[in-house]
């Protein structure tokens, strides 16, 4: 039951997070424009990965979109790519991870294709996540750097006492969001990927148990359950089955840095 | 169309109050701003203000946010504009306008005059 | 707050002529967002309340005469007159819609020959 569980959460996990990367990646609101020790404007300037928007007091909004490829900064581009490629994996992955659902019967599917494909998708979305958060620390870094450049010559003379003010830019929601999102995916993968141990069908040498009955070494090998996977021969003769009723899949759960979840 | 009504003149003694109100018509009152704006006879425009009908929200030039308040009442689809301590120096017509693209104000109502007098 | 100067404060000129009045602003008004300037003209004529020529510099408001042009970027703008008509006698404004609080220039008096 645990495994079936831990896949499912894993799942739900992860596509909520996939959700919000591709909410992320389509959010306007990547950088915004910086209100503190600013002039008050009546004008408010905010960039996404895709077009730039202007909302006026007045109520209106104008967004106009990059219609130019070559003429865009190539740390843009890299976000954009890491946040498609996420998107992509993630789709995949999600796509991989129905067919790989415990509690979905698909024909004669195998406990060993079902782990495969568990372990595929919790790959997939590991990635998937760190695409995501990539590209997002990769644009915050740059809004970073320019809105410390800006802030270096913020009020560029134009000689007289005419002067210019630089609209600086400080992180919008979609960074947020992005980050959040990534950091689901991320754990939804792993859950997948602890949930694939569960699933993978056991090592069929099952290990000899020995009971000592009237002097003689009689060989008892326990079936109807699934062995645990045991590292090393077992010398001491103890008893590795404890005999009591346990579902299939029921497995040792150990502490995980992701037990928070 | 697009109008703005704005109530009478008013000639009031210093020291007093006076609320002056604009009633729009012809557009949906809580999507646009109202501007309030004071010209004094023969002088230039100033920008007093704006309220946000539909959430209340204002935005005061610094230097009349003691003399006047904005409010909005959305049931009777309305603009109001409270002028408080009133002195000779407030004499003015008062004009409401609505904000439009470009912040700018493209209807305005006919204005009040008010006349602080002893 | 941000000063707009308009020059000269009054002209006189005859029916038919062309003409130029000037509106400098203290800082500039283009928003870098949409490369938009944010600057206003009006024209008022007495007893009347101010009405909208342009917007956002050099746009025309609808149903205003296309002898009326807006131009300039930055802090330095200009309002074109192209054949002057006797019904344009009015006040003419610019007003900054960029920064709060938003003013108005004193305003260039248009009087007819």
């Known amino acids: 039951m645990a495994v079936t569980a831990c896949q499912g959460l894993g799942f739900v996990v992860s596509l909520i997070g996939i959700a919000g990367i591709i909410a992320a990646t389509c959010m306007d609101q990547w950088s915004t424009q910086d209100l503190y020790n600013n002039p008050v404007t009546a004008v408010f300037n905010y960039q996404g990965l895709w077009r730039s928007c202007v909302r006026e007091s007045s109520g209106f909004t104008e967004c106009r979109g990059y219609f130019t490829l070559l003429g865009l900064p190539a740390m843009l581009q890299a976000v954009r790519a890491l946040m498609i490629v996420g998107i992509v994996l993630g789709a995949i992955g999600l796509l991989v991870s129905i067919f790989a659902l415990k509690c979905i019967r698909i024909g004669s599917m195998e406990d060993s294709a079902k782990a495969n494909m568990t372990l595929t998708s919790g790959i997939m979305f590991i990635v998937s996540g760190l695409c995501a958060i990539a590209g997002v620390s990769v644009f915050a870094n740059m809004l970073v750097t320019n809105f410390w450049m800006s802030t270096a010559n913020m009020y560029t003379g134009m000689g007289g006492m005419v002067q210019t003010v630089q609209t600086r830019y400080t992180f919008g929601a979609a960074l947020f969001v992005g980050w959040v999102a990534g950091g689901l995916t991320l754990i939804g993968g792993v859950m997948m990927c602890i949930a694939c141990r569960g699933l993978a069908p056991e090592e069929t040498n099952y290990k000899a148990v020995s009971y000592h009955a009237s002097g003689h070494s009689v060989a008892y090998k326990p079936g109807g359950f699934k062995a645990s996977t045991g590292f090393g021969s077992n010398t001491k003769n103890k008893k590795i089955y404890d005999g009591g009723a346990r579902t299939e899949d029921e497995v040792q759960s150990y502490p995980s840095k992701h037990d928070y979840v | 169309q697009v109008q703005l009504q704005q109530s009478g003149r008013e000639v009031v003694r210093p020291g007093t109050s006076v609320k002056v109100s604009c009633k729009p018509s012809?557009?949906?009152?809580?999507?646009?701003?109202i501007d309030w704006v004071k010209q004094r006879p023969g002088q230039g425009l100033e920008w007093i203000g704006g309220?946000?009908?539909?959430?209340?929200?204002?935005v005061y030039n610094e230097k009349f946010k003691a003399k006047a308040t904005l409010t909005a009442d959305k049931s009777s689809m309305t603009a109001n504009m409270q002028l408080s301590s009133l002195t000779s120096d407030d004499s003015a017509v008062y004009f409401c306008?609505?904000?439009?693209?470009?912040?700018?104000?493209?209807?305005w109502g006919q204005g009040t005059l008010v006349t602080v007098s002893a | 707050d941000i000063q707009m100067t308009q020059s000269p404060s009054s002209l006189t000129v005859t029916a038919g002529e062309k003409v130029t009045m000037s509106c400098k602003s203290s800082?500039?008004?283009?928003?870098?967002?949409?490369?938009?300037?944010?600057l206003t003209w009006y024209q008022q004529k007495t007893g009347q309340p101010p009405k909208l020529l342009i917007y956002?510099?050099?746009t025309r408001e609808s149903g205003v005469p296309d002898r009326f042009t807006g131009s300039g970027s930055g802090t330095d703008f200009t309002l074109t007159i192209n054949s002057v008509q006797a019904e344009d006698l009015a006040v003419y404004y610019c007003?900054?819609?960029?920064?709060?609080?938003?003013?108005f220039g004193a305003g260039t008096k248009l009087e007819i020959k």
């Open positions: 309220i946000n009908p539909g959430s209340g929200d204002t």
């Open positions: 012809g557009y949906a009152f809580t999507n646009y701003l």
């Open positions: 306008a609505r904000r439009v693209r470009g912040n700018s104000f493209d209807s």
């Open positions: 800082q500039s008004l283009l928003n870098s967002g949409n490369q938009r300037n944010y």
């Open positions: 956002w510099a050099s």
């Open positions: 007003q900054n819609n960029y920064y709060y609080p938003l003013t």
